[in-house]
């Protein structure tokens, strides 16, 4: 073969363009725009198209994109053309993989590991630097040592324990201690130095439709800060939930479709059906967010190629609160939620 690409796990096959009858272009000059800008669905940004011509509703995660129909920059999305090489005509909106970090004036890319000094190994994860110690000193000398001290050793990075009453140290004990330390191994010591940390899940990247939520956790074998992600869908974009609000009420906290359906992702379908709960909407200024939820694992089967599983937010209950801004403003998600007293129906 004339090309040997590194295999990719999932590829996107774009719909073929009308080959010879129409021009496979997406920008036209001079610009031709409708008289009034479109009204975007809940949670979708109104932006200038990639031709720098007209106002359009930004393409969302998983949507097709072109040089004209660009992805929502406010959500950190970009058009991934890798499924349409070498034409680069139609792509899929994908999530930019995390933001970098700056530490002491040095910029690190998301996921990059580095050593700011000889005592720590750090990793940049989505703007947060997490570090684990490299100086994994053994525990202080055992009972025989009455005056242990932690001292710097010339030419060495890590401090070491010394015992001022070395002369009285029994030989047999010394031998046992050395063995005990050798047998303990670095993994056990690293774990002993590890303070378990898991951040809260970030708000869903979309207010409706499929989005992504992330968190950072070092609860793993290496005590290493790693970014975890899960899919989330706070509410469907294509259902007018307001129609389901009961007479005399202003909110529907939870919306649950009557029929169980399969989840779909990138052309792949969940191996079983689900009847998820979604957060509802209000007719006043309140917005509804999850307050009881968990993460479930969903198995997907693809028409071609192997299946895969994804972590998915599973909503059990939602509440409606007063801290809302324009629903097309992604940053509204970052508002701190008020006390539970403000929950109303």
């Amino acid at each position: 073969t004339a090309l040997s690409p590194t295999p990719t796990t999932m590829t996107f096959t774009p719909a073929p363009l009308e080959e010879t009858t129409t021009r496979p272009e997406f920008c036209k000059w001079p610009c031709e725009c409708p008289q009034s800008p479109p009204r975007c669905p809940l949670g979708v940004s109104l932006i200038t198209d990639g031709c720098e011509c007209c106002k359009i509703c930004a393409q969302q995660l998983g949507d097709n994109c072109t040089e004209a129909a660009i992805c929502d920059p406010h959500r950190g999305l970009y058009c991934d053309y890798s499924g349409d090489r070498p034409r680069y005509a139609i792509g899929v909106c994908a999530q930019v993989v995390g933001v970098g970090c700056v530490l002491d004036g040095v910029r690190y890319t998301n996921g990059e590991s580095f050593q700011p000094n000889c005592r720590y190994n750090c990793t940049c994860i989505d703007g947060t630097v997490g570090c684990t110690p490299l100086c994994l000193s053994p525990r202080p000398p055992r009972l025989w040592c009455r005056q242990p001290r932690h001292v710097r050793v010339p030419g060495q990075c890590c401090e070491q324990w010394v015992c001022d009453d070395d002369a009285r140290r029994p030989r047999q004990t010394a031998l046992l201690d050395t063995r005990a330390f050798a047998a303990s191994g670095a993994v056990e010591q690293r774990y002993e130095n590890c303070i378990a940390y898991t951040s809260p899940w970030s708000p869903c990247s979309t207010t409706c439709g499929l989005g992504i939520s992330t968190r950072i956790s070092n609860v793993n074998a290496r005590c290493w800060p790693e970014q975890e992600s899960r899919l989330c869908n706070l509410r469907p974009c294509d259902v007018d939930i307001q129609l389901h609000i009961k007479a005399g009420k202003k909110c529907l906290a939870v919306y649950q479709p009557e029929e169980a359906t399969n989840f779909t992702l990138a052309g792949c379908v969940s191996t079983r059906t689900y009847r998820p709960k979604y957060c509802g909407v209000c007719t006043d200024n309140r917005c509804c967010i999850p307050y009881k939820s968990k993460t479930i694992s969903v198995d997907f089967q693809c028409p071609e190629g192997p299946g895969f599983s994804r972590q998915v937010l599973w909503i059990n209950a939602c509440f409606c609160n007063l801290s809302c801004r324009n629903p097309n403003d992604i940053f509204a998600d970052l508002e701190s939620y008020p006390d539970f007293e403000e929950i109303a129906n």
Partner: antibody, heavy 117, light 107 residues
Framework: EVQLVQSGADVKKPGASVKVSCQAS????????IHWMRQAPGQGLEWMGW????????GYAEKFQGRVAMTSHTSTSTVYMELSRLTSEDTAVYYC??????????WGQGTLVTVSS | DIQMTQSPSSVSASVGDRVTITCRAS??????LAWYQQKPGKAPKLLIY???TLQSGVPSRFSGSGSGTDFTLTISSLQPEDFATYYC?????????FGQGTRLEIK
Amino acid sequence: EVQLVQSGADVKKPGASVKVSCQASGYTLTSYDIHWMRQAPGQGLEWMGWINPNSGNTGYAEKFQGRVAMTSHTSTSTVYMELSRLTSEDTAVYYCARGAMGGFDPWGQGTLVTVSS
Amino acid sequence: DIQMTQSPSSVSASVGDRVTITCRASQDISRWLAWYQQKPGKAPKLLIYAASTLQSGVPSRFSGSGSGTDFTLTISSLQPEDFATYYCQQANTFPITFGQGTRLEIK
């Protein structure tokens, strides 16, 4: 302004390796593939391969299989092309270029690699 | 691999002339053809992509046409800065291939 800036000219002996860098600015490196082409003195353009800086995936022309390696370092927005087991026939100007709809735009300014004993 | 053949390999013309360069693909590439201009000591510059779409910032005297296997680049009224070498390139399938180039010289 979207720009690709390449490393300076290099002279190598036959059998050696050369590593050419290509630094992107004015856009997010991980959003587009980078391709490498070369042009021998007085000759036409020859495509060598591509790299996706986001995933690290690569694809190489059969002619260069086994002696070319394309890598990326996203924190410095830089892509590298290393060609090993050089011969005099590898003397050329090497270009990096961003994969765009139906073509390459922009191109780096080019790096002259001379292989001479 | 898809072979790209340009003709003529060189052409002499004067300022104000209309010049046409052709490019033929050894198999159907739909409209996935790009045209580049290269001046001595410089990198190629994208003029036209998808057979007929003018790249932003390129003067309108450049135009492209064709589909399938036969394509043309036309310069409607030559300007002094247009004297250069022009390459076609297919972007339909890997490996990407270029034409051998057409040198446009001052008559």
